[in-house]
Amino acid sequence: EPTMYGEILSPNYPQAYPSEVEKSWDIEVPEGYGIHLYFTHLDIELSENCAYDSVQIISGDTEEGRLCGQRSSNNPHSPIVEEFQVPYNKLQVIFKSDFSNEERFTGFAAYYVATDINECTDFVDVPCSHFCNNFIGGYFCSCPPEYFLHDDMKNCGVNCSGDVFTALIGEIASPNYPKPYPENSRCEYQIRLEKGFQVVVTLRREDFDVEAADSAGNCLDSLVFVAGDRQFGPYCGHGFPGPLNIETKSNALDIIFQTDLTGQKKGWKLRYHGDPMPCPKEDTPNSVWEPAKAKYVFRDVVQITCLDGFEVVEGRVGATSFYSTCQSNGKWSNSKLKCQPVDCGIPESIENGKVEDPESTLFGSVIRYTCEEPYYYMENGGGGEYHCAGNGSWVNEVLGPELPKCVPVCGVPREPFEEKQRIIGGSDADIKNFPWQVFFDNPWAGGALINEYWVLTAAHVVEGNREPTMYVGSTSVQTSRLAKSKMLTPEHVFIHPGWKLLEVPEGRTNFDNDIALVRLKDPVKMGPTVSPICLPGTSSDYNLMDGDLGLISGWGRTEKRDRAVRLKAARLPVAPLRKCKEVKVEKPTADAEAYVFTPNMICAGGEKGMDSCKGDSGGAFAVQDPNDKTKFYAAGLVSWGPQCGTYGLYTRVKNYVDWIMKTMQENSTPRED
């Protein structure tokens, strides 16, 4: 327990002290006092450096003194023989004696008292930054006006922290600027702007004068800027050493000004303003930015438009442009969106044609459609080449997005007809010579395939049976063979409106307009044995002249049998109509004069007994196309005749081309379009 005074006596004092003793006393006076220790009696064996016996005075780690020998007072008015004054409140006294004493020594008597110390003057380190005030047992620090005493109760500083600046523009200066700034202070200023604005600090070199750095380059007084995880500074010296324009890239900035106890200068002054946060001009491939600017800032909106052939895809839909906003964090919204090549997808397949699997279906890719040659050709031109266009469609230079149409090649037999074996009234033929030949089984007759959906025949063939069964692709019409051939199912029969329907068809004498069309339910697949015949053109080139040759084919009556099982054919010349008129009707059902002959009829035959006959009706009279020798067209249809083996009459198809085209157009299906 600290005491204000006390007495310390050597062992046995005032008797002689014993040998081999060590005793210590810990002196403690109250905090804020020093110790005055004085000896009134000293009688200790003398030795060099007091090595044998001694009294030692220790303050902390320091030996204040070591005493031995005899002392007497120099002052007759004072009993003090030795004294010590320490400015601390603790002291240790240690007495030691060795194993022998040559004489009898009485030791020592000492006293201590607590004494006041002047903390303001007694120490090398001044305890107060500004004013020091001593009192008995302690001291206190005080500050000049406008300064305040820090929590350590020793240091004074100015109250320069806590200011928060939220305006978009402002000015901040060190305390007292341009007068010297306060020492020993830490000033903190906060700038807090709306998100989306960055703080930009501007200084002038001459507006900055802060105590310079020490020899190691460390600022004694310093100005530091902290923006998030970025720091600018510390700065010090005469004239601002940093950039005069600091873009912080942050809406929050802390300014910290730290000063020490010495070397005050005029300080600093700065301006700040809020700049809208910039967003980088990003390189977005395959697109253009609108508006195009050198610099984009917070709240700027750009329209990013993909170049032709590129799009932004979301799920199954795409867009060619989108909007992007420069956001408060300095980044673009929608930066994920990328313009990627348009994908036209797998091209559609076409009837009777194909498209090879494309290597790519992306913008700019090329595909080629082809038709199943030699039976189909591309009707609508364009060459079949399509490229993947910017709108995501496969596009042809001629047709645009319209798909090519593969239509049957007409009038080209796979094998030309040759009259090999001379038989009465004609030759055996193969269906490949007349792939357009259609067989009607009730009545036994013929027809001509003119496209995938239509069969041309004589009106008298279908007037009695509006749902005829037809076959294509077979040379033989034996039942077993027909089972393997292609049967055609009619959807509707269209008889020419000029064909006169009779109660008793057997007595007919007027075969004018003997033409009909049969619309099929399903399209016919073309091949070597099934292929249409062409229709005549409307130009005068297709007007027949006497002597022009044509081919007829069918399974009608021959010289030997009522019906042929295998296809027969003959080549006949066109004859003047009068030649047909001159032939006597074989089994007249009426007066010979009653038979009607019109310009809608062609007369042909009369040579070597070659003629069509019963059962050949409706079959084509095929003539070589005057403009394309590789093709045949249906110049006529087997209609009637005065007598088999002479001349026959054929419906003049050229006169009905308009009716045929109109009927087909009006009764086409979407599948055909």
């Epitope: 329209q303 979301e314 909007y323 964090n329 994920k336 969106l337």
Partner: antibody, heavy 116, light 107 residues
Framework: QVQLVQSGAEVKKPGASVKVSCKAS????????MHWVRQAPEQGLEWMGW????????IYAQKFQGRVTITADTSTNTAYMELSSLRSEDTAVYYC?????????WGQGTLVTVSS | DIQMTQSPKSLSASVGDRVTITCRAS??????LDWYQQKPGQSPKLLIY???YRYSGVPSRFSGSGSGTDFTLTISSLQPEDFATYYC?????????FGQGTKLEIK
Amino acid sequence: QVQLVQSGAEVKKPGASVKVSCKASGFNIKEYYMHWVRQAPEQGLEWMGWIDPENADAIYAQKFQGRVTITADTSTNTAYMELSSLRSEDTAVYYCARSRLFFAYWGQGTLVTVSS
Amino acid sequence: DIQMTQSPKSLSASVGDRVTITCRASQDVRTALDWYQQKPGQSPKLLIYSASYRYSGVPSRFSGSGSGTDFTLTISSLQPEDFATYYCQQQYTTPYTFGQGTKLEIK
């Protein structure tokens, strides 16, 4: 197929926080933006903010700034929305939605009730 | 922030009617406007994006038009399943904002 499945309904006291999850399947959230939209009872839709899970960049509506935190865990393909300092007017159905060009897919919604 | 104002707030119509809902933006949003349909207890569903493009699977009776500040959603012939609340939303700039909604009820 694309699906966003949200966590179940929550009842919270005023001042508390709530964290709603949105688990995505059928796509990778890193390739899209994940938004949060709320709808108070008998009220309209209110956009709260979004996150780009690829880089964790988030943007919030000014109204919710400081109270909402949108995060994403790409390893579990899940987005989260945490709303703090709840008050009674935060009672609403909270939806997550996926976007690139538009909000094509939405979660089923999570009802958060704030009541003392 | 861009404000979106829908009109009318609610409307009654009959099956087969032609219905038009309008949406006005407080500033130009070009064509960055989407329309959503929401039925009670369900999440919103996208109908129209970029002002006029019908989203996949949306019936052709729904159409959108407009650009700048004035937009329209039209239902050409109302079907029973169309009675719901419709919202417009601008995606021109953040924060993305919705209209307050138009409730379509059976007359």
